[in-house]
Every structure is written in structure tokens, then in C-alpha cells.
């Protein structure tokens, strides 16, 4: 694709190439044959993040605490505010417009990956030899107790939800 009539950081208007406004500024008036493009800084709580010819700046995102949101990074004239979720909650989408409580892993499942502000808890079923007997957003699957190392024997087999029960070895009379 050949280049267009106006260079990078310019735009074509009324048969001439005008300079775009830099990030953080909005367009007030197009250039003319005799004048440069006129730009103005965005106001408080506004931003534009690209070279542009916008006549209005965008409003910074509001991190609504009623939706479980808090400010992760305050917006500038060139960047939007970045929201994240309160502790124990995570974003419902990439845009992080609302939050939901982290999911807990049920008994029989352990935490594979602890939730973050932007991702939910990832659970995994406890494999043979491991168990989880609680509903938790933090607990991994625990290995069954090794009766042998305690000089004990398995009296009750473990499951994915219960540990083995160890007992004393039967003494030969």
C-alpha cells in the first residue's frame, strides 16, 4: 500500500495536511494555509491516548467502589484510569467494569492457581494420593498421610476428600 498524501502524525483536510494533536490534547481548529492546527490540553479527569483530531477528550474511567472496584493506576491526560478489584474479588472482563467474589474450590478439588485482581481461582481435581476436605480459595490438594513413615498402617483408605486413617500394626501374638 503506497503512503497517503499526508505524512505520519498529519491528517488531510480541505486539500492540505494538518498536524494531528499530540496525546493529551484535543483539536480546537484545523490548520489553514496560513495557520497551524490549534490544540488544547485535556481537562482534569480527561484523556486522549493517541495522536488525534478529536474535538472532545474522553472521560477517565470511574472505578466504582459499589461494584467492588478500586483505582490501580490513576489516569493522566494521556492515559485512562486502570481499575482493579478489592481484595478477594476479580474483574468480570478485560475492561474490568465490575467485580465478582473469587470462587472457592470445593472438597475434592484444590487450588491450581490463586485468583488475582483480573483472574478467578483455577481449581483442579485432587489426583490419587491427594485430598482436599475444605472449600477454599487458597488451599491446594494435600498429599495423603504416609502411614509407613510413622510406622503405622492404613486403616482406612483415603479419597479425594479425605485423608487416609492410620493405625497401629497388628502385633503377632
Amino acid at each position: 500500500e503506497p503512503p497517503t498524501a499526508c505524512r505520519e502524525k498529519q491528517y488531510l483536510i480541505n486539500s492540505q495536511c494538518c498536524s494531528l494533536c499530540q496525546p493529551g490534547q484535543k483539536l480546537v481548529s484545523d490548520c489553514t494555509e496560513f495557520t497551524e492546527t490549534e490544540c488544547l490540553p485535556c481537562g482534569e479527569s480527561e484523556f486522549l491516548d493517541t495522536w488525534n483530531r478529536e474535538t472532545h477528550c474522553h472521560q477517565h474511567k470511574y472505578c466504582d467502589p459499589n461494584l467492588g472496584l478500586r483505582v490501580q493506576q490513576k489516569g493522566t491526560s494521556e492515559t485512562d484510569t486502570i481499575c482493579t478489584c478489592e481484595e478477594g474479588w476479580h474483574c468480570t472482563s478485560e475492561a474490568c467494569e465490575s467485580c465478582v467474589l473469587h470462587r472457592s474450590c470445593s472438597p475434592g478439588f484444590g487450588v491450581k492457581q490463586i485468583a488475582t485482581g483480573v483472574s478467578d481461582t483455577i481449581c483442579e481435581p485432587c489426583p490419587v494420593g491427594f485430598f482436599s476436605n475444605v472449600s477454599s480459595a487458597f488451599e491446594k490438594c494435600h498429599p495423603w498421610t504416609s502411614c509407613e513413615t510413622k510406622d503405622l498402617v492404613v486403616q482406612q483408605a483415603g479419597t479425594n476428600k479425605t485423608d487416609v486413617v492410620c493405625g497401629p500394626q497388628d502385633r503377632l501374638r
Partner: antibody, heavy 116, light 107 residues
Amino acid sequence: QVQMLQSGTELVRPGTSVKVSCKASGYGFTNYLIEWVKQRPGQGLEWIGVINPGYGGVNYNEKFKGKAILTADKSSSTAYMHLTSLTSDDSAVYFCARGGSGFAFWGQGTLVTVST
Amino acid sequence: DIQMTQTTSSLSASLGQRVTISCRASQDISNHLNWYQQKPNGTVRLLISSTSRLHSGVPSRFSGSGSGTDYSLTISNLEQEDIATYFCQQGNTLPWTFGGGTKLEIK
């Protein structure tokens, strides 16, 4: 004073091509865009495309993509429009004009007649 | 594409009369509206750019106004040399488009 001097009348055969020239004077050639316009007999004006003589960047009307090729030669301050695969629909007067807050200065027009 | 409409294709007026030619765009063109005069011999010149800016060398009897989608060219005191066809053109959005023209004749 600013002048846009176009090449003379062309009588050409269908299927051939033609190159119309537009020599600019009286201003800095690379400082302004050059626009091209078509006018069929007794009709209105139709925009073909625009070229930046400074570095050869172009924008075309979709309708003229593949029909018109715009170029410019800085050394001679001349813009060119190459019209290809001519048909009777291409018979028209073609104008070049210097940009800058509208089509500020126009050439006198070049009549292209496509006929057997 | 933006459509430019000059509803009056021809207009007859007397010398000395005030004449207004109108032009409508199919969408807002933010005052990027130019007016051209094409004489019977085919020569074209810019009269007014950006709605109301008089081009150098154009007599002050020509003026332009308008906003949004509706624009007009006014000749305050018609002279013989003003006999021509007048075209409006939008420079807001590619492709640039012209009105169909208004041919001005003397009564």
C-alpha cells in the same frame, strides 16, 4: 503569481493510455498538495485523487483506482496523471489544481478524447 | 461518500441584483465548504474557502455563509462578468465531492 500549466489536447485510441502533465510555478512545489479533477462534457466535477509532491504520497477516489496513476517530479515542478486502458467513458477535460484551503489554483484543463 | 446537492441547476438574474446560490451536504461537513466559479470558456477559480474566507483577488461582492449541512454563496451586486457556473465542494471527508453546479444567467 501561482500558475498551473497543463499539457495540450490528446486524441487517443481505446485501450491505450495517456499521460497528462501539470507544471506548477510561482510557489514552492513541495509545499502544497496537487489535486486532479475530471469533467465530462456538460457535466459536473469529479475528484480523481491527490498527491503530495514532497514525497509522492497519494489518495485516490476508489472509482479511479486502477484507472489513474498520480506522480510528481520535484526537479521540474511537474505533476503527472497517467490514465490507463482508456475507453469512451474517459473522454473528458482533466484539471489539476493546487491545494491549500480548497483547490486554490486551477490549471486550464486538458481535453482527452478517446476515439477510434 | 458525502453527497453535495445544489438544488437550483440554473438561475436567471438581473444585473445589480443580489443572488444567493445554495448547497446542501448529506452530513455535517464542519464548515469545510468551498465555492468555485467556472467561466463559459472552461476556466475554474476558487472564490471562497472554508465557508466564508474570500480567496485572494476575488471581489468583495462575493460572500459565503453556512454551517453543518447547509451553505450558501451570495453575490451582492451581480455584474456581467459573474455569468458562470458555480460549484460547491466539501473538503471534510475523502473522497472530496462537488455539487452539480448552478448556472447563472442574465435576465
